[in-house]
Interface confidence: low
Amino acid sequence: ITRQSLDPQRRAAPQQKRSSPTEGLCPPGHHISEDSRECISCKYGQDYSTHWNDFLFCLRCTKCDSGEVEVNSCTTTRNTVCQCEEGTFREEDSPEICRKCRTGCPRGMVKVKDCTPWSDIECVHKESGTKHTGEVPAVEKTVTTSPGTPASPCS
């Protein structure tokens, strides 16, 4: 059972906006009341819902881990987007942690791609141009990051 399938019950603050459900569902940015008669807005910066839903609560906003930067803050309809900080990247195989980018290419190889928040540096052989992705001893420190599509939010 995922975190989202076991839905907590959150009590609505008095100032939260309310409307009526449509066909038993509430719009993004809202959750349903316990008697299913009202849609209650999520609390900005605290929780959110991205789809039409019948949740008894809004999903809690992700807090970025240390080693991550907040690219987009949480709104009532979108979770926080976290990105690895400069000099680190998130691998597809282990998306839960930011790994340090290699600081340079081994001898006989040249860097063709800088470190980004979602990929390590890329090295190719000077002559053949074939890629090399293994861990290597550092020979030069060239670490740059460029903004781009952030990794999927961690929750």
């Epitope: 076991l6 839905d7 907590p8 009590r11 038993g24 316990e34 019948d54």
Partner: antibody, heavy 121, light 118 residues
């Protein structure tokens, strides 16, 4: 007095079908969500399916999705569970339960006595 | 690992107080959940005992005496059912549950068998 009475259980072969019914009385049936919960012999409780007060929204446990259908007839104060493609692991006592959804509790506050479904060749 | 963990069995003497535990898996936060408790005596259907969200937001099941009470330990991610003045008829299986979707109401724990020693 709230009463829920299940019927329709019995012995069925694997792959077969069965339709369970639950007759409700003692409360305004059309204003409450209803559920089916099962209990395999000597085991714990497993929520099976739920339906909202009007019958518009239906929900199923992953283990029965695509095989079981929950429905209700508010004019007859009745809840149903159509069970198709039955498997040995569906063998259990099936309880009909009321969702206290007109209050803030949202608990399964009243239960029937249960009906036994046995799937065996 | 189940979402809700309950010890399989507990026992206590007649007239004493016992506290049954329901531990929520640590990728969930019990602070934002209501905890439900059900009692099932042998050969009987389950009976709703109580719901506990907080001291100011809780409810007792129909005809359930106040010697059954709920509580939570948010730091330990646990819900509790306390039964005071244990009686022979309290010998039963006790299931905790957590609210799920607005209609898909419950995820049940595996249950704790309570034995009342005379």
């Amino acid at each position: 007095e709230v009463q829920l009475v299940e019927s329709g259980g019995g012995l069925v072969k694997p792959g077969g079908s069965l339709r369970l019914s639950c007759a409700a009385s003692g409360f305004t049936f059309s204003t409450y969500g209803m559920h089916w919960v099962r209990q395999a012999p000597g085991k714990g409780l497993e929520w099976v399916a739920g339906i909202n007060y009007s019958g518009n929204n239906k929900y199923y446990a992953d283990s029965v999705k695509g095989r079981f259908t929950i429905s209700r007839d508010n004019a007859k104060n009745s809840l149903y569970l159509q069970m198709n493609s039955l498997r040995a692991e569906d063998t259990a006592v099936y309880y009909c339960a009321r969702d206290s959804s007109t209050t803030r509790t949202r608990a399964l506050d009243y239960w029937g006595q249960g009906t036994l479904v046995t799937v065996s060749s | 690992q189940p979402v809700l963990h309950q010890p399989p069995a507990m026992s206590s003497a007649l007239g004493t107080t016992i506290r049954l535990t329901c531990t929520l898996r640590n990728d969930h936060d019990i602070g934002v959940y209501s905890v439900y408790w059900y009692q099932q005596r042998p050969g009987h259907p389950p009976r709703f005992l109580l719901r506990y969200f907080s001291q100011s937001d809780k409810s007792q099941g129909p005809q359930v005496p106040p010697r059954f009470s709920g509580s939570k330990d948010v730091a330990r991610n646990r819900g509790y059912l306390s039964i005071s003045e244990l009686q022979p008829e309290d010998e039963a299986m006790y299931y905790c549950a957590m609210g799920a979707r607005s209609s898909v109401t419950h995820v049940f724990g595996s249950g704790t068998q309570l034995t009342v020693l005379s």
